[in-house]
Amino acid sequence: EPTMYGEILSPNYPQAYPSEVEKSWDIEVPEGYGIHLYFTHLDIELSENCAYDSVQIISGDTEEGRLCGQRSSNNPHSPIVEEFQVPYNKLQVIFKSDFSNEERFTGFAAYYVATDINECTDFVDVPCSHFCNNFIGGYFCSCPPEYFLHDDMKNCGVNCSGDVFTALIGEIASPNYPKPYPENSRCEYQIRLEKGFQVVVTLRREDFDVEAADSAGNCLDSLVFVAGDRQFGPYCGHGFPGPLNIETKSNALDIIFQTDLTGQKKGWKLRYHGDPMPCPKEDTPNSVWEPAKAKYVFRDVVQITCLDGFEVVEGRVGATSFYSTCQSNGKWSNSKLKCQPVDCGIPESIENGKVEDPESTLFGSVIRYTCEEPYYYMENGGGGEYHCAGNGSWVNEVLGPELPKCVPVCGVPREPFEEKQRIIGGSDADIKNFPWQVFFDNPWAGGALINEYWVLTAAHVVEGNREPTMYVGSTSVQTSRLAKSKMLTPEHVFIHPGWKLLEVPEGRTNFDNDIALVRLKDPVKMGPTVSPICLPGTSSDYNLMDGDLGLISGWGRTEKRDRAVRLKAARLPVAPLRKCKEVKVEKPTADAEAYVFTPNMICAGGEKGMDSCKGDSGGAFAVQDPNDKTKFYAAGLVSWGPQCGTYGLYTRVKNYVDWIMKTMQENSTPRED
């Protein structure tokens, strides 16, 4: 607790002090006072530099004195033998004695009193910027007229801050302008305009005179403009050194004028006004601005329209134009939006065809669709070339945005059939000679693939089994081979409405309209061993003449086998219907006259004993297309016969083309359309 005065005595005083003592006293007087410490008695063993015994006076880190020996007063009117005056309010006194004393020393008596200090004069650093006033225990600062004392109670400045300018035009000057500005001041002026307007400051060189910079180039007095994160200045010197027109790009500007204690000049004067915030005329590629202007300012609205083939992509929606507004911050709204080339995207894949991965899917890019040749061809024309159009679609010159359709090539076997002799009297064949050949395992029979979804066969093959199991693509019908071939699953069987369904089909004598269609659940993939046969055209070119040759194939009875395991085939000529009528039916189920012969039947065979037989039913009688010799069409279907190895009767497919087309159309799937 600070005190105003006190007494300090060495141990045992006035008796002799003991050896080996170290004692300290911490003196503290109230703030604002100094300490006057004086000794009235001093009797301490003398030694060089008071090394043995001593009394030490310390102020902060400074040793004010170190005493030893004997002292007496020089002034008969004063008992003081030694004294110290410090301008601080704290002091430490330390007494030390060593291990022996040659004589008897009585030590010291000292007193301290709090004394006033003159803060205004006693220190090197003047505490007040202007006027300093001392009083007992302290001081205070004061200021000249029109100055005020800052919160630190030491510095004076002029009251030049706090002004906020909101008018769109105005003038600001330093205090007292054009008289000298006040020293030691910080003047802050704020300009706050409506958003969307930028502050533009204009100065004349002659309206600026501020204390010049020091030798290091640092302004002693300075004028600074701060607009957001941008700063202009500091400026100082005779004549304004900066740009005479400052576009701040901001609606808020802080003007800071800082002065020191020396060197006052006349100061400065400026004008400001608010400009609508300009927005840059940006170069937005592939677009047109409407309206077109040399300069755009706050609140201007433009419509930016993309050129053909370009679009604005926002989220998932594409648009051809957008509006942009010059905003209060000098930036265009929707500035992230750009006119990008229209992207037609990865082209859709097509069944049984392909499109090469395009290098680009952007506007103007070109892609080409191709079908899996030679098994498929492009049905709907157009050449397969598409370009990325301005509307974002892949477009073909002929088809527009419609995709090409790859449909199976019909009637073209991968390998031509060559007769090698053994069907009845026929030859071994490979499925590649007859890729349309379908195998039915129950009953053991045949059929002809006519497109991806449809199999043509004889009605008598499917009348007893409306869910036949069929196979394609295998020369051999040995079970292990069939497992590796393609099994076809029927969706529905369509028997010709003219086929008479009998209670006892075994007694049939009428095979008229012996034709049926099997709709498949899934499309068949074409290839070298699986590919359809063509249907006959409706023109007279497809009317068969006697002697025209056709090919039959199947796994039916041969001379040596009840059922062939490997495909057999034969080339037979068309014969007059009477030739079939003349052959005696081997096992008549009725009178020979009861057997029906109609124009819906083709008679063929009779040459070298070549004929179809049991197990070949439903297979195609394939004839070379008169208009395209590379192709075969199904002129007939193996139907019935009077006797194997003679003549056989085949359903005349040409008479059923309308029914076939109608049935297929009415029972197609969207996938196929």
Epitope: D428, D441, N442, P443, W444, A445, G464, S476, V477, Q478, T479, S480, P505, E506, W555, R557, R561, D562, R563, A564, V565, R566, E586, K587, K614, Q643, C644
Partner: antibody
């Protein structure tokens, strides 16, 4: 379901004839071939022959050429085997069998008919 | 006629072991790359039952422990592991050439 139902056991005098039947269900015999197989008591199997019911085309093992006659009636879906001039050597179980969806084997057999030749 | 010889009339095999039954034809039963050899199992009082067709194809519904191999004139039926219910007589049969013929049969007993 494919089934072959054979006629019942026969006890016949030596020198007489007998006609065995095999009635099919679940398929048309016209679409298949009917085979006949003989098995003497405690003996192995012997192939008698086959018939194509569609045209009565037949094939016999030489041994049975004069002993057996195969016929088929597609209207009743039945095949028959007639054995003539019976002797004790003809005492056996006679089976009918078909191909089904096979091409040279018998996945389907009748239950067999026992023919006993005894004076 | 093609004669089929099953050299073993009688075969006794321990439960769980392998049974091998062979069949030799007097001439090849191959045609067009296929072997016309089939195997049947017969139990007393029952018709024969198809096990293997075309030398190596397992008839549907027959356990996989039955397998067939061979071509030309030499064929084998393997059963592994043998089970109690496999006690029966086994016949080979060729259908390559008329008349179709059967082997004499091999009777399998389970020890």
């Amino acid at each position: 379901e494919v089934q072959l139902q054979q006629s019942g056991a026969e006890l016949v005098r030596p020198g007489a004839s007998v006609k065995l039947s095999c009635t099919a269900s679940g398929f048309n015999i016209k679409d298949d071939y009917i085979h006949w197989v003989k098995q003497r008591p405690e003996q192995g199997l012997e192939w008698i022959g086959r018939i194509d019911p569609a045209d009565d085309h037949t094939k016999y093992a030489p041994k049975f050429q004069d002993k057996a006659t195969m016929t088929a009636d597609t209207s009743s879906n039945t095949a028959c085997l007639q054995l003539n001039s019976l002797t004790s050597e003809d005492t056996a179980v006679y089976y009918c069998a078909i191909y089904g969806s096979g091409w040279a084997w018998f996945p389907y057999w009748g239950q067999g008919t026992l023919v006993s030749v005894s004076a | 006629d093609i004669v089929l010889t099953q050299s073993t009339d009688y075969l006794a095999v321990s439960l769980g072991q392998r049974a091998t039954i062979s069949c030799k034809a007097s001439q090849s039963v191959d045609y067009d790359g296929d072997s016309y050899m089939n195997w049947y199992q017969q139990k007393p009082g029952q018709p024969p039952k198809l096990l293997i067709y075309a030398a190596s194809n397992l008839e549907s519904g027959i356990p996989a422990r039955f397998s067939g191999s061979g071509s030309g004139t030499d064929f084998t039926l393997n059963i592994h592991p043998v089970e109690e219910e496999d006690a029966a007589t086994y016949y080979c049969q060729q259908s390559n050439e008329d008349p179709w013929t059967f082997g004499g049969g091999t009777k399998l007993e389970i020890k």
